[in-house]
Interface confidence: medium
């Protein structure tokens, strides 16, 4: 069971300081941006982190949304990352959900975050380069200190 707590507006960056945004095709990508670029590209660079109470405490449960024309929420259905046109619900009556991730700080690095899927244990949001694009993907954690699954989250409220 997950119960919605509160939401906050955030900018999410990978450890190369690239900013996460949602492109015109609703794809979550990372790109180098100045602070000015970041503001100019809002709301595509501003993510709503919806915090949830978890009935089985496993970390801070979150759903990640973005509001462009409509609200879309990040999903990892079938281990594929996509934004689905939906509002994060107030309550989710299950212990797993494709839209719920556990946000935890990296041990020894309180300002660095990682997001583990509640549906696929051991799978984390990650940044991966594919040709000339830096994509947000779901990746099985396979090594200690993997920088690709670490992010910084900047509160924009």
């Amino acid at each position: 069971y997950f119960g919605k707590l509160e939401s906050k507006l955030s900018i999410i960056r990978n450890l190369n300081d690239q900013v996460l945004f949602i492109d015109q095709g609703n794809r979550p990508l990372f790109e180098d941006m100045t602070d000015s670029d970041c503001r100019d590209n809002a709301p595509r660079t501003i993510f709503i982190i919806n915090m949830y109470k978890d009935s089985q405490p496993r970390g801070m449960a979150v759903a990640i949304s973005v509001k462009c024309e409509k609200i879309s929420t990040l999903s990892c259905e079938n281990r594929i990352i996509s934004f689905k046109e939906m509002n994060p619900p107030d309550n989710i009556k299950d212990t797993k959900s494709d839209i719920i991730f556990f946000q935890r700080s990296v041990p020894g690095h309180d300002n660095k975050m990682q997001f583990e899927s509640s549906s696929y244990e051991g799978y984390f949001l990650a940044c991966e380069k594919e040709r000339d694009l830096y994509k947000l993907i779901l990746k099985k954690k396979d090594e200690l200190g993997d920088r690709s699954i670490m992010f910084t989250v900047q509160n924009e409220d």
Epitope: G3, K4, L5, E6, S7, K8, M51, Y52, K53, D54, P57, G59, M60, P89, D90, N91, S105, D110, N155, E156, D157
Partner: antibody, heavy 120, light 111 residues
Framework: EVQLVESGGGLVQPGGSMRLSCTAS????????MSWVRQAPGKGLEWVSG????????YYADSVEGRFTISRDNSKNTLYLQMNSLRAEDTAVYYC?????????????WGQGTLVTVSS | QSALTQPASVSGSPGQSITISCTGT?????????VSWYQQHPGKAPKLLIY???HRPSGVSDRFSGSKSGNTASLTISGLQAEDEADYYC???????????FGTGTKLTVL
């Protein structure tokens, strides 16, 4: 200017009921989770209850679970706390506050508080 | 859920630095980065000084700073001023049923 104004406090007998209201202005009320925090005379702060933006997520401290009910009316920009089966230990100044979990770069906002006295 | 543990009182002279500790468990302070610090003057509502362990809201003096190590969070006030005399409370998200917990409070006296 952000304002939170609590009302509804006063004197009530043990076992009685009371409803507190908190009227918000100066911000988009339905975009924020809200909470109630209380402070007994001369004592520390105690988180009482919180509610999500849409009102579907409601949470309580163990000390008030089953006796208090938090709710909100976003059309009226108002937060409520219905308090039943009141006890002497519920005597406190009750504050409404936003936000209540993560804090925010723009700070947070508290009402001036309303005093609830439970006594015979 | 027990309150987080803070020293009942601390004191310092103007210009000095003081640190207030806030000790919890791995279910609250140690497990999450949702630790806040509040200042409360007598008869007034609390004011947020620090959120998410070490972030300062706009308008809060940079003399106030927050940190965390393990299950203990700390608030440091540098260059103490007379107006810093107040009660200070930490708070944290908790995975217990109570969801959110405050510290016991610390009275700061500026000598």
């Amino acid at each position: 200017e952000v304002q939170l104004v609590e009302s509804g406090g006063g004197l009530v007998q043990p076992g009685g009921s009371m409803r507190l209201s908190c009227t918000a202005s100066g911000f988009t009320f339905d975009e924020y989770a809200m909470s109630w925090v209380r402070q007994a005379p001369g004592k520390g702060l105690e988180w009482v209850s919180g509610i999500s933006t849409g009102g579907g997520g409601t949470y309580y401290a163990d000390s008030v679970e089953g006796r208090f009910t938090i709710s909100r009316d976003n059309s009226k920009n108002t937060l409520y706390l219905q308090m039943n089966s009141l006890r002497a230990e519920d005597t406190a100044v009750y504050y409404c506050a936003k936000p209540w979990l993560s804090g925010s770069r723009s700070g947070d906002f508290w009402g001036q508080g309303t005093l609830v006295t439970v006594s015979s | 859920q027990s309150a987080l543990t803070q020293p009942a009182s601390v004191s310092g002279s103007p210009g000095q630095s003081i640190t207030i500790s806030c000790t919890g468990t791995s279910s609250d302070v140690g497990g999450y980065n949702y630790v806040s610090w509040y200042q409360q003057h007598p008869g007034k509502a609390p004011k947020l000084l620090i959120y998410e362990v070490s972030h300062r809201p706009s308008g809060v003096s940079d003399r106030f700073s927050g940190s965390k190590s393990g299950n203990t969070a700390s608030l440091t006030i540098s260059g103490l001023q007379a107006e810093d005399e107040a009660d200070y409370y930490c708070s944290s998200f908790t995975s217990s049923s109570s969801l959110y917990v405050f510290g016991t409070g610390t009275k700061l006296t500026v000598l």
